[in-house]
């Protein structure tokens, strides 16, 4: 029995519903009474959902899963996973047994977009060219971990003196804080780009600093 699932991971946004597709080719005369369908976590073999003895046996996974009962007889064994969480990410195995049997694993990739970065400056007043300032770019509640890039007003990447930290909250979503230490020119724009590598989503923040003009002591 050939069991088919998508080769590419299924990408689902946190809080939305995802469909893990799985199909098989029933032989002529196939009846649902013969079907034993198991969805389980690939690594731990924890039961997620099952269909046995001609009946949907329900969700064993936080009551957030459902089959498509009207489509089972046509060989559609797909699983609906509701209100996706970060903890759901991973591989799910679809196992189908009739007379023959087969299985295949589908990957679920969870994602959440990052918020528009907020920019803070320290110190934030009486700045002069030559001063060293700390610019912090903060973006919240994204998944998976972000990639952070800094550049100046001319689009030149700034890679030195950057410290980035990412902390997961209780839902597994990341808050990212990236700190750039820079010596001010006469004036300048500093941009931070927070990229979600799964969604290919870029969130931009920028700050423009106008330095006070340099004052020199009068010549003797």
């Amino acid at each position: 029995l050939e069991v088919q699932v998508p080769e590419d991971p299924v990408v689902a946004l946190v809080g939305t519903d995802a469909t893990l597709c799985c199909s098989f080719s029933p032989e002529p005369g196939f009846s649902l009474a013969q079907l034993n369908l198991i969805w389980q976590l690939t690594d731990t073999k924890q039961l997620v959902h099952s269909f046995a003895e001609g009946q949907d046996q329900g969700s064993a996974y936080a009551n957030r899963t459902a089959l498509f009962p009207d489509l089972l007889a046509q060989g559609n064994a797909s699983l609906r996973l509701q209100r996706v969480r970060v903890a759901d990410e991973g591989s799910f195995t679809c196992f189908v047994s009739i007379r023959d049997f087969g299985s295949a694993a589908v990957s679920l990739q969870v994602a959440a977009p990052y918020s528009k970065p907020s920019m803070t400056l320290e110190p934030n007043k009486d700045l002069r060219p030559g001063d060293t300032v700390t610019i912090t770019c903060s973006s919240y509640r994204g998944y998976p971990e972000a990639e952070v890039f800094w550049q100046d007003g001319q689009g030149v990447p700034l890679t030195g003196n950057v410290t980035t930290s990412q902390m997961a909250n209780e839902q597994g979503l990341f808050d990212v804080h990236s700190v750039l230490r820079v010596v001010l020119g006469a004036n300048g724009t500093y941009s931070c780009l927070v990229r979600n590598p799964v969604l290919q989503q870029d969130a931009h923040g920028s700050v423009t600093i106008t330095g006070q003009p340099m004052t020199f002591p009068p010549e003797a």
Epitope: N36, Q57, F95, R99, D100, G102, A104
Partner: antibody, heavy 117, light 108 residues
Framework: EVQQVESGGDLVKPGGSLKLSCAAS????????MSWVRQTPDKRLEWVAT????????YYPDSLKGRFTISRDNAKNTLYLQMRSLKSEDTAMYYC??????????WGQGTSVTVSS | DIQMTQSPASLSVSVGETVTITCRAS??????LAWYQQKQGKSPQLLVY???TLPEGVPSRFSGSGSGTQFSLKINSLQPEDFGRYYC??????????FGGGTNLEIK
């Protein structure tokens, strides 16, 4: 008449390898999942490996994964079990069995494997 | 993995008597249970599958019952050819489809 004839069992030293065969006849071999099951000297039955009809899925107990490989040649109506790094606890009678779902509806007569120095 | 516990390990009975062998699964296997009979020097033979379905050729004195985690095989009016070993095996879900430890049924 459904028939499965196992062969390839032998006396082998620990660490050695052996390949068992099961020649099937009397049914459409390519339509059925097949398993190897062994019976230890104390008469316990132990599931060893399973393969589905097309050979796309194979299943093993964690304890044997990596050492044993099940395969099939549907053109030759033959099931195989490659056993490597054999241990004394692999000593058993090895049966091939045909599946109807998870239940095994026909078994061969078995082939004996003894692992001893 | 699902564990199968079979009892008794052995029993000695007379021809004509009725015997019951039980099998317990460590978690629900619904009705996906098979029983096998093995006579001395022979390979196992399927006796019952899906708890109570008898393959063609199996005498009606054999009957299976149960569901979930508790199952039994009953043999009415034992015949001389019924003596041997009996094994239960679950066939629910993905392998391993484990076997019980076996019951040796001998003539008293």
């Amino acid at each position: 008449e459904v028939q499965q004839v196992e062969s390839g069992g032998d006396l082998v030293k620990p660490g050695g390898s052996l390949k068992l065969s099961c020649a099937a006849s009397g049914f459409t071999f390519s339509s059925y999942g097949m398993s190897w099951v062994r019976q230890t000297p104390d008469k316990r039955l132990e599931w060893v490996a399973t393969i589905n009809s097309g050979g796309s899925n194979t299943y093993y107990p964690d304890s044997l994964k990596g050492r044993f490989t099940i395969s099939r040649d549907n053109a030759k109506n033959t099931l195989y079990l490659q056993m490597r790094s054999l241990k004394s606890e692999d000593t058993a009678m090895y049966y091939c069995a045909r599946h109807d779902g998870g239940a095994m509806d026909y078994w061969g007569q078995g082939t004996s494997v003894t692992v001893s120095s | 993995d699902i564990q199968m516990t079979q009892s008794p390990a052995s029993l000695s009975v007379s021809v004509g008597e009725t015997v019951t062998i039980t099998c317990r699964a460590s978690e629900s296997i619904y009705s996906y249970l098979a029983w096998y009979q093995q006579k001395q020097g022979k390979s196992p033979q399927l006796l019952v599958y899906n708890t109570k379905t008898l393959p063609e050729g199996v005498p009606s004195r054999f009957s299976g019952s149960g569901s979930g985690t508790q199952f039994s095989l009953k043999i009415n009016s034992l015949q001389p050819e019924d003596f041997g070993r009996y094994y239960c095996q679950h066939h629910y879900g993905t392998p391993p489809w484990t076997f019980g430890g076996g019951t040796n049924l001998e003539i008293k």
